[in-house]
Amino acid sequence: CKAMHVAQPAVVLASSRGIASFVCEYASPGKATEVRVTVLRQADSQVTEVCAATYMMGNELTFLDDSICTGTSSGNQVNLTIQGLRAMDTGLYICKVELMYPPPYYLGIGNGTQIYVIDPEPCPDSDF
């Protein structure tokens, strides 16, 4: 297993609709054809897997149908979008990149993107 540098923004504020997008850029030492991207969430000292996708270079990322993540790839960067976020989902979202094929296997873990989610104010009751 060889180490690889992964860069991602330090902080992002989700939209009022609970959508957050961020880039995950990796310094690929070789010509990988198969890449796996995993998003991990760290909060309250707990780390959980949010979503993961394996893709072939030049193809779209494919997450599971029920995943809250979508993404696109371009060269050595992946643009990730997480939707359906609420204030309780605020936390550090860490991008993990694995170059699966061809060998050697490379692993890179970013410092994480702190995503803040602010629930919208409830609309005041109207008389209509």
């Epitope: 991602q8 923004p9 330090a10 902080v11 992002v12 504020l13 989700a14 939209s15 997008s21 961020f22 909060a43 309250d44 204030a87 309780m88 605020t90 936390g91 702190q114 803040y116 602010i118 629930d119």
Partner: antibody, heavy 116, light 108 residues
């Protein structure tokens, strides 16, 4: 090294607007947030809000909503805070600061005096 | 809005003594997202502690943060002459993010 350099002191009349600038250097500007905090003479710190430079999303404290606008220009690594309809109790030092989890770097502050 | 109450308002101590500053929240602070700052007259504040207990870069280890939920503490194990200043806590676990009113640590 990380630096945030703010524009100079301003004197404004009640009802006017002020726009304070904050030029960042020494780090990847759009990877961090910029927050704005003010401090009235002899008083404590007051959070005004922040902007996520990466996507331009903002979060303003309710008391300033409709009166404040925070923006950034990523081509010049500069953040701006505009406060409108100034009142005498807006007299304060306004700080810009880099935000992630806590404010780790601060500008030197801009004194805004509102007086007729 | 989460209201932060700092106590005491003023702490009079001598160099070498231990300082204990408290910050109480009106409701639980999510993920212990609480920071402590030091401010000296005429200067911008300086981040000491974030996430309740993580020391910021370059901060001496005599500063430590602890607590969770609604009760947080900043401890200065041995006061140095340069530590006499104002101290503010700030929560960023619930919008709007708020500061406490501050504790002044003065020389006795």
């Amino acid at each position: 090294q990380v630096q945030l350099v703010q524009s100079g002191a301003e004197v404004k009349k009640p009802g006017a607007s002020v726009k304070v600038s904050c030029k960042a250097s020494g780090y990847t500007f759009n990877y961090y947030g910029i927050s704005w905090v003010r401090q009235a003479p002899g008083q404590g710190l007051e959070w005004m809000g922040w902007i996520s430079v990466y996507n331009g999303n903002t979060n303003y404290v309710k008391k300033f909503q409709g009166r404040v606008t925070m923006t950034t220009d990523t081509s010049t690594n500069t953040a701006y805070m505009e406060l409108r309809s100034l009142r005498s109790d807006d007299t304060a030092v306004y700080y810009c600061a880099r935000w992630v989890r806590g404010v780790d770097y601060w500008g030197q502050g801009t004194l805004v005096t509102v007086s007729s | 809005e989460i209201v932060l109450t700092q106590s005491p308002a003023t702490l009079s101590l001598s160099p070498g003594e231990r300082a204990t500053l408290s910050c109480g929240a009106s409701q639980s602070v999510s993920s212990n997202y609480l920071a402590w700052y030091q401010q000296k007259p005429g200067l911008a504040p300086r981040l000491l502690i974030y996430d309740a207990s993580s020391r910021a870069t370059g901060i001496p280890d005599r500063f430590s943060g602890s607590g969770s939920g609604t009760d947080f503490t900043l401890t200065i194990s041995r006061l140095e002459p340069e530590d006499f200043a104002m101290y503010y806590c700030q929560q960023y676990g619930g919008s709007p993010w708020t500061f406490g009113q501050g504790t002044k640590v003065e020389i006795k």
